[in-house]
Amino acid sequence: LPLNSSTSLEKNNVLFGERYLEKFYGLEINKLPVTKMKYSGNLMKEKIQEMQHFLGLKVTGQLDTSTLEMMHAPRCGVPDVHHFREMPGGPVWRKHYITYRINNYTPDMNREDVDYAIRKAFQVWSNVTPLKFSKINTGMADILVVFARGAHGDFHAFDGKGGILAHAFGPGSGIGGDAHFDEDEFWTTHSGGTNLFLTAVHEIGHSLGLGHSSDPKAVMFPTYKYVDINTFRLSADDIRGIQSLYGDPKENQRLPNPDNSEPALCDPNLSFDAVTTVGNKIFFFKDRFFWLKVSERPKTSVNLISSLWPTLPSGIEAAYEIEARNQVFLFKDDKYWLISNLRPEPNYPKSIHSFGFPNFVKKIDAAVFNPRFYRTYFFVDNQYWRYDERRQMMDPGYPKLITKNFQGIGPKIDAVFYSKNKYYYFFQGSNQFEYDFLLQRITKTLKSNSWFGC
């Protein structure tokens, strides 16, 4: 149960928790029984776990002190459950020159300070992308910056001081891209009140198509925390996210190994996002690319994912093959695609939850099919699930800890594939482990790129 006793304070906490989870994690309050305190709590508990998991709290399923504290923290109004990288539907601006207009100014700050804070916030994103932003003072801008209080012309009214600080809409026409700041906050240039620059960097991230990140160091983390604006920098997670949408700055501004430049195959620090066999080949996925290794041959070739499968996204996170069916399953965020005979099947992507994962699972780190048992192993954070491909359902008793059942592997893995009828090859960062699943132990430790003769 999320809560056991029914004091008025705890009742208030439950109601507050429900509203928070409805707003940011999609809890369907209509599905909760009227007698909430007697309610067994599965729906609520699952959403609490989902929130705790996303925001890096201890996953208890209870409305404990740290969870309630986090729920009361000032934050962005955009929901959390759409996994990081892009907003649902994946909108991006289809151009590199983007205009913005400041519709009205908060009385809390000098106009020049507002202009400066907003300009610097856009600059944060233009520094790491090919995007160029220019301010216009009249006419229709792509991104409208608005200070408003309460109900203000969308479905998402502000809530007074504290709570929701701002929200923004992903790229698109009309309201698309617009960033709204709650005028009931006290906006500042410093650490007092709410810092406009820091909030604007976050909201512009949404305006460009990013969703929330579960990395507490990321500017796209949902809650507000002041950091020194003079030393402020985007996290690696933020940069990876925005560059997956727009690429990196061109020519002389090039970043080291951005998402859209081909990674060096023999870089000793190279890691992979996903690896799977496809017939007698091995596919190694990284960012927008995959390498193709034909078994027992030294030659490898690099390709864009989009050149083979134009409808698939970059940044594939997990993959597995069922060779007997000529099927390959590819995963990104909470969606998966089915490839049959190297062709994408129609009516995909579909939700990973159709496999039977609980709602707090938002992405798969790695997956592997074992044809001997006709089971697929799904690795998520430090746990794994086992799925019966014949019965099309999860085996009971899962998830289990990776470290408990795969000796020497874990706690988390990046990728895994099955080969030679007895080995799993686990990838963790730049390391790879050959694991004999019959002996249940590691038989070799290799570099991740050892398959390429590096």
């Epitope: 999609g26 955009v78 929901p79 649902p88 539907g89 203000h152 012309g153 969308d154 479905f155 309201i175």
Partner: antibody, heavy 122, light 103 residues
């Protein structure tokens, strides 16, 4: 071609219940917010409810809050409106409408169904 | 709460006329205003979104303008098929409608 087809309307007594359905085709249903809008005979349009792409996020007009429940089944490309404790003033043609956006609704309806008539009368 | 007031509530005009319908919000809604056309027994059809953007497939004789609290829908030269009811809307709020009839 985008198509929305409502069904489930009919005559119901005050206090009764009805479940409306809206079958969607011609677009990726699971990517978009969906809405119900109603129109009483000879009157204007009234927004009723909306639901987010995954089914989690719902909003209701004050006039139906606590009585109506919006839901969706993305595997069937179908939107639903469960209407309980119906009143005479709920008599209207109910339209389902597709939002132009797939995240954080703007309430801009680019496609509408033909509507289904709900009559609440004893 | 935001309210939308449309005027006039009805209007008689002739083919070829220039017609203007106005919509006023009781507080600023920036450019978040849309216009719909509805013919008897039919579903509404989106004409203009974001105050002035023409929805694809809508004839260019329809135009929208305004921002903040005051908005207008203009039909530059009325055609027989334009006689209908017009609604302004933002988020979950519709204006009460303007019925455009043949004079």
């Amino acid at each position: 071609e985008v198509q929305l087809l409502e069904s489930g309307g009919g005559l119901v007594q005050p206090g009764g219940s009805l479940r409306l359905s809206c079958a969607a085709s011609g677009f990726t249903f699971s990517d978009y917010n969906m809405h119900w809008v109603r129109q009483a005979p000879g009157k204007g349009l009234e927004w009723v409810s909306y639901i987010g792409p995954s089914g989690g996020y719902t909003h209701y007009a004050d006039s139906v809050k606590g009585r109506f429940t919006i839901s969706r089944d993305n595997s069937k490309n179908t939107l639903y409106l469960q209407m309980n404790s119906l009143r005479a003033e709920d008599t209207a043609v109910y339209y389902c409408a597709k939002d132009i956006r797939g995240a954080y609704s703007s309430g801009l309806f680019d496609y509408w169904g033909r509507g289904t008539l709900v009559t609440v009368s004893s | 709460d935001i309210q939308m007031t449309q005027s006039p509530s009805s209007l008689s005009a002739s083919v070829g006329d220039r017609v203007t319908i106005t919509c006023r919000a009781n507080q600023s809604i920036y450019t978040y205003l849309n216009w719909y056309q509805q013919k008897p027994g039919k579903a509404p059809k989106l004409l203009i979104y974001a105050a002035s953007s023409l929805q694809s497939g809508v004839p260019s004789r329809f135009s929208g303008s305004g921002s903040g609290t005051d908005f207008t829908l203009t039909i530059s030269s009325l055609q027989p098929e334009d006689f209908a009811t017009y609604y302004c809307q933002q988020a979950g709020i519709f204006g009460q409608g303007t019925k455009l009839e043949i004079k």
